[in-house]
Interface confidence: low
């Protein structure tokens, strides 16, 4: 009888992660008697995948009933494939021996390639907030994909960015790969509602790329502009002075009124109005009893925004004559007062 041959008809098999790989193997003869074993890799460091004779291999099932003596089909199925399963698999016929079975003939091998989807891109921004006109870096990371070829793009509000650097690791062969990209973004005052998007395209995604996003609201700090105005007389000896704090983000803001340099009142912006661009406006007022002052009063609205050094705006209040309206409230539709004091 012709000597047994081990035939692995498939040089390569491509499987998507999570699916089942079928590795085909047939023998041309029923002799010699002995078990079939499957290995990944060759040489002394090869990894046993399945042993017909003994062992427990929960991920492996046989295509046919290997308990039957007349069986010559030694194909196996490996379930729940991951990138770590990639490699060349060998179907090896052993001859019964003593004290151990002896390797008799090996198949040519089947290369299992695993197509693994990249993980959802994770975009992270700078640790500290930055102000408009500054350039900030965003990183995008995605892991676990295979094959190595991958395309990464950056967008800001739908517009593709060009200032970025991307690396795919490792450089050599690997069961799976990771991508790391850093993009530079110039902030503008309108970026509170902006998003930076990292888009990853890969053969496993069938034209439907994965996206990771970062909201620039987590990154940007828009410093407020201040306007102090004197309102019409409320009562004979009282003047209402308002401090309009406009176009700031984030909301964390503390306002202090000073009369001639002395702290009069400190308050925290609680309920504010939101502009269409995502920035906030707030208004605080101070009722000044003019009769309590002999000389002119310098009123200062001092604002500490998001833990930054305070900015201030002053207003000189003339107390010599009856106060008249000095300036007007020119707040736009979204910049009305929103000091929700409980009266």
């Amino acid at each position: 009888e012709e000597e047994l041959q081990v035939i692995q008809p498939d040089k390569s098999v491509l499987v998507a992660a999570g699916e089942t790989a079928t590795l085909r193997c047939t023998a041309t003869s029923l002799i010699p008697v002995g078990p079939i074993q499957w290995f990944r890799g060759a040489g002394p460091g090869r990894e046993l995948i399945y042993n017909q004779k003994e062992g427990h291999f929960p991920r492996v099932t046989t295509v046919s009933d290997l308990t039957k003596r007349n069986n010559m089909d030694f194909s196996i199925r490996i379930g729940n494939i991951t990138p770590a399963d990639a490699g060349t698999y060998y179907c090896v016929k052993f001859r019964k021996g003593s004290p151990d079975d002896v390797e008799f003939k090996s198949g040519a091998g089947t290369e299992l390639s695993v197509r693994a989807k990249p993980s959802a891109p994770v975009v992270s921004g700078p640790a500290a907030r930055a102000t408009p006109q500054h350039t900030v870096s965003f990183t995008c990371e995605s892991h676990g994909f295979s094959p190595r070829d991958i395309t990464l793009k950056w967008f800001k509000n739908g517009n593709e960015l060009s200032d970025f650097q991307t690396n795919v690791d490792p450089v050599g062969e690997s069961v799976s790969y990771s991508i790391h990209s850093t993009a530079k973004v110039v902030l503008t005052r309108e970026d509170v509602h902006s998003q930076v998007i990292c888009e990853v395209a890969h053969v496993t995604l069938q034209g439907d790329p994965l996206r990771g996003t970062a909201n620039l609201s987590e990154t940007i700090r828009v410093p407020p502009t201040l306007e102090v105005t004197q309102q019409p007389v409320r009562a004979e000896n009282q003047v209402n002075v308002t401090c309009q704090v406009r176009k700031f983000y984030p909301q964390r803001l503390q306002l202090t009124w000073l009369e001639n340099g002395n702290v009069s009142r400190t308050e925290t912006a609680s309920t504010v109005t939101e502009n269409k661009d995502g920035t906030y406006n707030w208004m605080s007022w101070l009722l000044v009893n003019v009769s309590a002052h002999r000389d002119d009063v310098k009123l200062t609205c001092q604002v500490e925004h998001d833990g930054q050094p305070a900015v201030s705006k002053s207003h000189d209040l003339k107390v010599s004559a009856h106060p008249k309206e000095q300036g007007s409230n020119t707040a736009a539709e979204n910049t009305g007062s929103n000091e929700r004091n409980i009266y």
Epitope: T273, G336, E339, R340, I342
Partner: antibody, heavy 118, light 107 residues
Framework: EVQLVESGGGLVQPGGSLRLSCAAS????????MHWVRQATGKGLEWVSV???????YFPGSVKGRFTISRENAKNSLYLQMNSLRAGDTAVYYC????????????WGQGTMVTVSS | DIQMTQSPSSLSASVGDRVTITCRAS??????LAWFQQKPGKAPKSLIY???RLQSGVPSKFSGSGSGTDFTLTISSLQPEDFATYYC?????????FGQGTKLEIK
Amino acid sequence: EVQLVESGGGLVQPGGSLRLSCAASGFTFSSYDMHWVRQATGKGLEWVSVIGTAGDTYFPGSVKGRFTISRENAKNSLYLQMNSLRAGDTAVYYCVRGGNWDDAFDIWGQGTMVTVSS
Amino acid sequence: DIQMTQSPSSLSASVGDRVTITCRASQGINNYLAWFQQKPGKAPKSLIYTVSRLQSGVPSKFSGSGSGTDFTLTISSLQPEDFATYYCQQYNSYPYTFGQGTKLEIK
């Protein structure tokens, strides 16, 4: 469709407790301030409570210390826990979304009736 | 608390009429004023916010105006479905407060 559905109303004795629920659907619940407003039969509207997106809460003096408001964003649900109930708390209670840029009310539930009586 | 006073408390008008309801705040509310319509047995419906902005789906026959402490709701041409009770509300400061309502009845 944006919808608010209140439940949990009923008859309770003075001094008793009741918990109202409001199930929200059709919008990103966690992004909105949510309010409770009540209306006694034949009377006007009275604002009862608000809970902001950050969990901050406010109450008028009439219910302060007796009512608590809470939200469970994962379940798109708003709650009003009413303790030490009085006859004056008898009303239809509405769940309302503060839906505009300035927290103006835009969506109202159908209301649930609370009767406090011995 | 900020008091909201509506006038008149009730109003009789005919279909096709133009009607105006006024609302006065006890102090400035920075234009955080809303108007609501309520029909018997129903939940209120939001009509107007920040004095003059129409809520989505509200017909343009409703209009709001005013500033400071005095505000008005105008219905340009009354239709049968417009007969209801109307409330103003300030939402400038907590506690938010409503006017006592204006009942609009068919003459």
